[in-house]
Interface confidence: low
């Protein structure tokens, strides 16, 4: 070690090193002194004489102790997308970082250099995975019992609430409505809202969608309408259903009563028991608007009655592509105007337990005043313990509806509903909707 | 434009040793100065170790590190290297390579690599 202090310039030990904020000037083979942050180098050292620093001007900056002949200019002013959340200075350069609701789609060195909007899911979707400061939104569709009503970039599906009476059965989109009795909720809704990222970080992390929790049988086609929002399968507590199964059970037994009587009275009724077709789409028509339902006949015995555990309750079914299904005998594929049906009953996946059970009771009570049949259809609801991860599907069944659900649908699902409005994304920048493979 | 790529980051143990690389490559005019900065959460960037051109080759350490990090360069890769011997708990902090380099018109221009993270723990 010298005994005293070098002022600099001075000329360093052979292999030994200038000091801390020093620099090795090559011209003059001389350690010289760097210029402090906020400064840069007018005059170089010479063998006699030290550097000459002078101040940035402005709009420049040098950030570190340097020997640089001109300052480094600041970036350009924040675009109105982005906040200044560092302002240029002699010393530090401008950061501009994405304002609330804005994530970076295009990150620099310090800051943003393109922001992009958060995508929005519509009603029927729920965001599965909130926007950060790097990545977008990520929409998964409503699964069965739960709705998100709202266009937001933080609403997650909610569930249903349970009702003692069910007016309205909720659907994706839509929460059920009780009758004047204080409803229940199925499970703690949780927080509604996700919080809104701030953007305070500057490294940029390529935004990798996650694992998608939505179906698998979600698709999301590119043009034309988006698909509508999904099934509207009622979310009912158990002993509800079972009240409902019962109830229609008795008048199942009551229907065969009466035409037991019927036939002992030896009048002969035409009834004729009516059943949809149930029509077997492909994938682009199933997108469509949908037709008028056509009501094709099958004549069956007198005093028949027909019961069925698939449930004709369910909406069409609003997301999944048609499977290639074996036809039910006597249920053959038709025209194109018709719609197509499709159970609420849910694969259990590995992280929930959820059972649901779809019961249809179709009674048909035939009275013979003048040869002609009158035969009225009681259908039951759906029921079950939907206790189940957001990841089930709804299996794509073929069933028959009767008369009086295809009215009850009909208020439910007006043109408006079924074509749910296309998801506004103003940049094509964030990553497609994770699940949501284009089939 | 020039990238800085480093590498050799990573756990180690006290008193263990690691050794970070830092390749520069792109359009590079001449090099003013290579070093490593680290930084720590809630904290700014210091300086740990920078080369700067000259014929002895002089270095600069911050005090924390003199004596168990050495810091060389390759001429003909562009890369500068860090060894690091004795490592201590508080060494635990992203490393950024960092090229002070000159411009066609002699002006000044900082770039920084992404950063590699040490993290010194038992």
């Known amino acids: 070690l010298p005994a005293q202090v070098a002022f600099t310039p001075y000329a360093p030990e052979p292999g030994s090193t200038c000091r801390l904020r020093e620099y090795y000037d090559q011209t003059a083979q001389m350690c010289c002194s760097k210029c402090s942050p906020g400064q840069h180098a007018k005059v170089f050292c010479t063998k006699t004489s030290d550097t000459v620093c002078d101040s940035c001007e402005d709009s420049t900056y040098t950030q570190l102790w340097n020997w640089v002949p001109e300052c480094l200019s600041c970036g350009s002013r924040c675009s109105s997308d982005q906040v200044e959340t560092q302002a240029c200075t002699r010393e530090q350069n401008r950061i501009c970082t994405c304002r609330p609701g804005w994530y970076c789609a295009l990150s620099k060195q310090e800051g943003c250099r393109l922001c992009a909007p958060l995508r929005k899911c519509r009603p029927g979707f729920g965001v599965a995975r909130p926007g950060t400061e790097t990545s977008d939104v990520v929409c998964k569709p409503c699964a069965p019992g739960t709705f998100s009503n709202t266009t937001s970039s933080t609403d997650i599906c909610r569930p249903h609430q349970i009702c003692n009476v069910v007016a309205i059965p909720g659907n994706a989109s839509m929460d059920a409505v009780c009758t004047s009795t204080s409803p229940t909720r199925s499970m703690a809704p949780g927080a509604v809202h996700l919080p809104q990222p701030v953007s305070t970080r500057s490294q940029h992390t390529q935004p990798t969608p996650e694992p998608s929790t939505a179906p698998s049988t979600s698709f999301l086609l590119p043009m034309g309408p988006s698909p509508p929002a999904e099934g509207s399968t009622g979310d009912f507590a158990l002993p509800v259903g079972l009240i409902v199964g019962v109830t229609a059970l008795g008048l199942l037994i009551i229907g065969v009563v009466n035409c037991v009587i019927m036939t002992q009275v030896k009048k002969k009724p035409l009834c004729l028991q009516r059943e949809a077709k149930v029509p077997h789409l492909p994938a682009d028509k199933a997108r469509g608007t949908q037709g008028p339902e056509q009501q094709h006949l099958l004549i069956t015995a007198p005093s028949s009655s027909s019961s069925s555990l698939e449930s004709s309750a369910s909406a069409l079914d609003r997301r999944a592509p048609t499977r290639n299904q074996p036809q039910a005998p006597g249920v053959e594929a038709s025209g194109a105007g018709e719609a197509r049906a499709s159970t609420g009953s849910s694969d259990s996946s590995p992280g929930g337990h959820g059972t649901q059970v779809n019961v249809t009771c179709i009674v048909n009570v035939c009275s013979s005043s003048d040869h002609s049949s009158q035969c009225s259809s009681q259908a039951s609801s759906t029921m079950g313990d939907t206790d189940s991860s957001p990841s089930e599907s709804p299996k794509d069944e073929q069933v028959p509806f009767s008369k009086e659900e295809c009215a009850f649908r009909s208020q439910l699902e007006t043109p408006e509903t079924l074509l749910g409005s296309t998801e506004e994304k103003p940049l094509p920048l964030g990553v497609p909707d994770a699940g949501m493979k284009p089939s | 434009q020039v990238q800085l790529v480093e590498s050799g980051g990573g756990l180690v143990q006290p008193g263990g040793s690691l050794r970070l690389s830092c390749a520069a490559s792109?359009?590079?005019?001449?090099?003013?100065?290579m070093g490593w900065y680290r930084q720590v959460p809630e904290k700014q960037r210091e300086l740990v170790a920078e080369?700067?051109?000259?014929?002895?080759?002089?270095?600069a350490y911050a005090d924390s590190v003199k004596g168990r990090f050495t810091i060389s360069r390759d001429n003909a890769k562009n890369t500068v290297y860090l060894q690091m011997d004795s490592l201590k708990p508080e060494d635990t902090a992203v490393y950024y390579c960092?090229?002070?380099?000159?411009?066609?018109?002699?002006?000044?221009?900082?770039?920084w690599g992404q950063g590699t993270q040490v993290t010194v723990s038992s």
């Open positions: 080369i700067t051109e000259g014929v002895n080759t002089p270095y």
């Open positions: 792109g359009s590079i005019f001449s090099i003013y100065a």
């Open positions: 960092h090229a002070l380099l000159a411009g066609p018109g002699g002006g000044g221009y900082d770039y």
